[in-house]
């Protein structure tokens, strides 16, 4: 009998609010034995795969997806999924990346550390949940983000 795969988690380093032009790294985590991690974007058809999987702990593996210079187009929700033979896991929750115009003000922090999305209950209608519906980019208060239509 195939094992039940735990849902992956996703986090962002150094955080989920990133100044334009700065770097961000998405960290996807799953159990030991993962062959491929995939990073997907809500409403986008593009994705990234990696088989560069490292062991984060005795029971966890992880993969890192780095964006060297964040632009407005990188804003929006991201999620992870992994392949542990012979099957794919469920998807992680979405993690929203916000891209901030550099204001130069000393009072506002550049990032929000410790942002992550961990496992929650999978929606029951899984046959229609592979990709979230299309969304449009919005600019508000010098933050680039995506508005959800749920």
């Amino acid at each position: 009998q195939e094992e039940d795969l735990p849902r992956p988690s996703i986090s962002a380093e150094p955080g989920t609010v990133i100044p334009l032009g700065s770097h961000v790294t998405f960290v996807c985590r799953g159990p030991v034995g993962v062959q491929t991690f995939r990073l997907e974007r809500e409403s986008r058809s593009t994705y990234n795969d990696t088989e560069d999987v490292s062991q984060a702990s005795p029971s966890e593996s992880e993969a890192r997806f780095r964006i060297d210079s964040v632009s407005e187009g990188n804003a929006g929700p991201y999620r992870c999924i992994y392949y542990k033979p012979p099957k794919w896991s469920e998807q992680s929750d979405y993690l929203e990346l916000l891209v901030k115009e550099t204001s130069g003000g000393p009072d506002s922090p550049d990032t929000e550390p410790g942002s992550s999305a961990g496992p929650t209950q999978r929606p029951s209608d899984n046959s229609h949940n592979e990709h979230a519906p299309a969304s449009q980019g919005l600019k508000a208060e010098h933050l680039y983000h995506h508005h959800h239509h749920h």
């Epitope: 491929t36 409403s43 986008r44 058809s45 593009t46 994705y47 990234n48 795969d49 999924i81 392949y83 033979p85 099957k87 794919w88 046959s127 229609h128 949940n129 592979e130 990709h131 979230a132 519906p133 299309a134």
Partner: antibody, heavy 117, light 111 residues
Framework: EQSVEESGGRLVTPGTPLTLTCTAS????????IQWVRQAPGKGLEYIGA?????YTYYASWAIGRVTISRTSTTVDLKMTSPTTEDTATYFC?????????????WGPGTLVTISS | ELDLTQTPASVSAAVGGTVTIKCQAS??????FGWYQQKPGQSPKLLIY???KLASGVPPRFKGSGSGTEFTLTISDLECADAATYYC?????????????FGGGTEVEIK
């Protein structure tokens, strides 16, 4: 070299179940969506359905109950449960492009299915 | 399920000229959209994916644009080899399943 190839097309009588197979070579099928498309003689392309990398299966509304799509580690099958003469066509399978689900860059040569009494 | 309306059904243009093909979707599909070229007796060939990205090996004379519900394929500096039938396809797999419908095709004749 990466390729997909359809097989199983032949002449059958109406109502005879028929299974077509899409075989992947040179790449890991588990990473990809595979779609089935058909083309009746002299007509346009018609989407039948798809098997996604994560194991979801989608069908065109007209195909629900008429076909079943399933996959193994190296193949994606299209089973025609009770074909009619209107199902006579060349059947193609195709794989989506690396890094983007929106386009299908790898197509097989097609397999001809003829339904006739 | 989504419908794609492709126009025109056929078009004739001279070598060196330009052809524009349009596809209209009945619902928004963002940029989950592709354009294909098919010649008689051959399998379809991907030209454009993501509504505007050029597939590998396709010359930049082929240009895709649009998003949401309106999409356009423009072929410039037409060559004899461009004579073919062109199809658009919705590839959106979402919370609302919108199918993978193709447009009806546009037959391009080169004079």
């Amino acid at each position: 070299e990466q390729s997909v190839e359809e097989s199983g097309g032949r002449l059958v009588t109406p109502g005879t179940p028929l299974t077509l197979t899409c075989t992947a070579s040179g790449f890991s099928l588990y990473k990809y969506n595979i779609q089935w498309v058909r083309q009746a003689p002299g007509k346009g392309l018609e989407y039948i359905g798809a098997s996604t990398y994560a194991g979801y299966t989608y069908y065109a509304s007209w195909a629900i109950g008429r076909v079943t799509i399933s996959r193994t580690s190296t193949t994606v099958d299209l089973k025609m449960t009770s074909p009619t003469t209107e199902d006579t066509a060349t059947y193609f399978c195709a794989r989506h492009i690396d890094g983007d689900y929106s386009g299908y860059a790898l197509w097989g040569p097609g397999t001809l299915v003829t339904i006739s009494s | 399920e989504l419908d794609l309306t492709q126009t025109p059904a056929s078009v004739s243009a001279a070598v060196g000229g330009t052809v524009t093909i349009k596809c209209q979707a009945s619902q928004s599909i963002d940029t989950w959209f592709g354009w294909y070229q098919q010649k008689p007796g051959q399998s379809p060939k991907l030209l454009i994916y993501g509504a505007s990205k050029l597939a590998s090996g396709v010359p930049p004379r082929f240009k895709g644009s649009g998003s949401g519900t309106e999409f356009t394929l423009t072929i410039s500096d037409l060559e004899c080899a461009d004579a073919a039938t062109y199809y658009c396809q919705n590839t959106y797999y979402g919370v609302r399943y919108l199918g993978g419908a193709f447009g009806g095709g546009t037959e391009v004749e080169i004079k």
